[in-house]
Each structure stands twice: as C-alpha cells, then as structure tokens.
Amino acid sequence: HNTTVFQGVAGQSLQVSCPYDSMKHWGRRKAWCRQLGEKGPCQRVVSTHNLWLLSFLRRWNGSTAITDDTLGGTLTITLRNLQPHDAGLYQCQSLHGSEADTLRKVLVEVLADPLDHRDAGDLWFPGESESFEDAHVEHSISRSLLEGEIPFPPTS
C-alpha cells in the first residue's frame, strides 16, 4: 500500500477519507488504527457500529470519530481539536472475523496553527513512519472548530 499524507492544523479538525470497493467489503465493519512501531502492533483507535447496517452512525473514541458510507464505499475519520501528538502513521481497515485488511495507509502531519502565537517549543511533536512509496499529500483541513477532548492515549 502507498501512503497518503493528510495535513492538518493544530487545534482544528482533520477529515481523513478512505475509499474502498463497496462490493468487495460488503457486510464488513471498518476500523481506524495507529501503527505503534515499524513492525509493531496497529492499535485500534475506533471502529464502526457493531451492526453493519448502522455503520453510517458516527462513533467516537475521545477526539476521533468514524463513519462509513457503505454504499458509496468511503470510510471517513474525523480527528477533532487536532494535537501535535495526533501525528503519525494510521491504517483504515476492513474487518472480517479476527482478520483485518488494510484499505489505506495514512500519514497524519500536524502543522502548528499559524494564528496561534504561543511558543511552538511548548508543543509536542510527533514522528515518522516506515518507508512509504510515493506518498500523496491531501490537504484535508477543516476550519470548523469543535470542542476538544483528551486525545486517545496509546496502550500496548
């Protein structure tokens, strides 16, 4: 899988879209996970509704939401009140049993808010990820500010 880069601004919302073949993945729940290491686990952040027919309903875990357009074949993840530590390598997944197929690899880049004059040195910055081929950049920056919640903490 190639990796798609989505750029967001700290404090704002970022929408990530993962297109897929709706027929091939018919009846499958979807998930959004964070790659914790090069060969390490991809930790589940949030998944779609337990009932596939209700996948269109937005589900939240902390500041991350997921919704699935099962007919159109587009999984949408929203990261609200984006923080520097939200940066990283993620995967959109299609679930079947205990297995998961990767729909898309996503690199989230978090840029400092140009209108925020706080000292950038007080922010935290994230990192990078395994070698990706020809990453495509999508400037997917939403200006609508939502009330922030505590970012999802990784656990092993």
């Epitope: 880069v5 940066a87 690199l107 910055f125």
Partner: antibody
Framework: EVQLLESGGGLVQPGGSLRLSCAAS????????MAWVRQAPGKGLEWVSS????????YYADSVKGRFTISRDNSKNTLYLQMNSLRAEDTAVYYC????????????WGQGTLVTVSS | DIQMTQSPSSLSASVGDRVTITCKAS??????LAWYQQKPGKAPKLLIY???NRFTGVPSRFSGSGSGTDFTLTISSLQPEDFATYYC?????????FGQGTKLEIK
C-alpha cells in the same frame, strides 16, 4: 537499510555559527519527521529540535530557541541544523535522528558529529 | 516538566546474570516510555518502545514492563555485548525527556 550521516561539526568560538547536515538514505525521507538530539561530553541525552515531514512546522528546546534553526531539503534527503550565537554549553555530539510516527521516540540515529564551542 | 529518574546510576554484573534497571517518572506517563542502549563512542540504539515492545532486531532477552510512574528494563541473561549505558525516555507527550542513564559494567 536506514542510514543517517551527519557532517559539519567542529571547533567554533563562543558567539560563532555552525551548520550541521544530515544525509538520509534507505527510507522515504519526505514521509518522516526528523530531529536533532545532543549529548554533552560524559552527560546524558537532550532533545534539541524537530520538524514535520514537509518542514511546515519546527520545534525547539528552550535551551536553543532563537539561536538554532532546523530545516530540511526533501529533494536532497537532507536535514540541517543552523546554530548561531553558540555557547560553551552547546558543546556536544549532535545526533540526527528519525522519529517514529507521532510517538516521540527515535528509531534510527546517525553516528553523531562533535561540536566544540571554546575560545 | 516530568522528570525521569533511573536507578541505579551504575551497576556491576556478570555474564549470565539477570539484570533489572528501573525508571521512575515524576508523574503518571501511562505506558509512554522507551528504552535505549548506548555503547561508548556510539550512537544510542532503540531497544523498547511503549514500555514493552521490542524494536526490530532486539534480542528477546530484553524486556520492558511497568506503567504509570514505575518502569523496568530487564535483561534475562547478560551477554558480553550488553555492557553499555541504558536510557529511558518519556514519549508521546511533551516534553521529551530522558533519564540520566544507567551504566552497566562487568563485575
């Protein structure tokens, strides 16, 4: 194989300037945040500066803010650290590091380049 | 800022020994901890990330555990190449701070 090769270190007088470079290979450089970490002689590790994969945002430790500038040239797979107004306490081995996805740990390190600030 | 304190500062052990190095955070850091190994004149190498995940190529004799404020790095059976200095590091949230290091020497 991931490789990071620093250069540009040396002896400089207090108040002087130096520019460090780090040539990266073995991975898609433009997809990674990068950072500089330093180690004073006989001391522990100290994070110095980082920047995002596009170079769109930069971050600095308080100890170097306003004096050091981190940058990158993704077309050349190279990371830089411009160091101005150098002080004796900046004397250290400077390591170029690659950072793993949003987690703040450094998975690959260069061999380091020594910067000595002395009159 | 959260401080990371390692103990002991130095440790003498023999090949084959089981060794434990501890790292204490001044506040709860969850499982957001990494460990590095550094040999004299060399760059540090990542050993463990997120408390317990071994990095690529790291031997299984190295293991990490803990959560909250107390963490340990264990070497189950010391090998000659393991004599080095070990650093813990708080990760994921700012600021990135390292412990002062634990020097593991041959007895």
């Amino acid at each position: 194989e991931v490789q990071l090769l620093e250069s540009g270190g040396g002896l400089v007088q207090p108040g002087g300037s130096l520019r460090l470079s780090c040539a990266a290979s073995g991975f898609t450089f433009s997809n990674y945040y990068m950072a500089w970490v330093r180690q004073a002689p006989g001391k522990g590790l100290e994070w110095v500066s980082s920047l995002t994969n596009s170079g769109g945002s930069t971050y600095y430790a308080d100890s170097v803010k306003g004096r050091f500038t981190i940058s990158r040239d993704n077309s050349k797979n190279t990371l830089y650290l411009q160091m101005n107004s150098l002080r004796a306490e900046d004397t250290a081995v400077y390591y170029c590091t690659r950072e793993w996805a949003g987690s703040g740990y450094f998975d690959y390190w260069g061999q380091g380049t020594l910067v000595t600030v002395s009159s | 800022d959260i401080q990371m304190t390692q103990s002991p500062s130095s440790l003498s052990a023999s090949v084959g020994d089981r060794v434990t190095i501890t790292c204490k955070a001044s506040q709860n850091v969850g499982n957001n901890l990494a460990w590095y190994q550094q040999k004299p004149g060399k760059a540090p190498k990542l050993l463990i990330y997120y408390t317990s995940n071994r990095f690529t190529g790291v031997p299984s004799r190295f293991s990490g555990s803990g959560s909250g404020t107390d963490f340990t790095l264990t070497i189950s059976s010391l090998q000659p190449e393991d004599f080095a200095t070990y650093y813990c590091q708080r990760i994921y949230n700012s600021p990135w701070t390292f412990g002062q290091g634990t020097k593991l020497e041959i007895k």
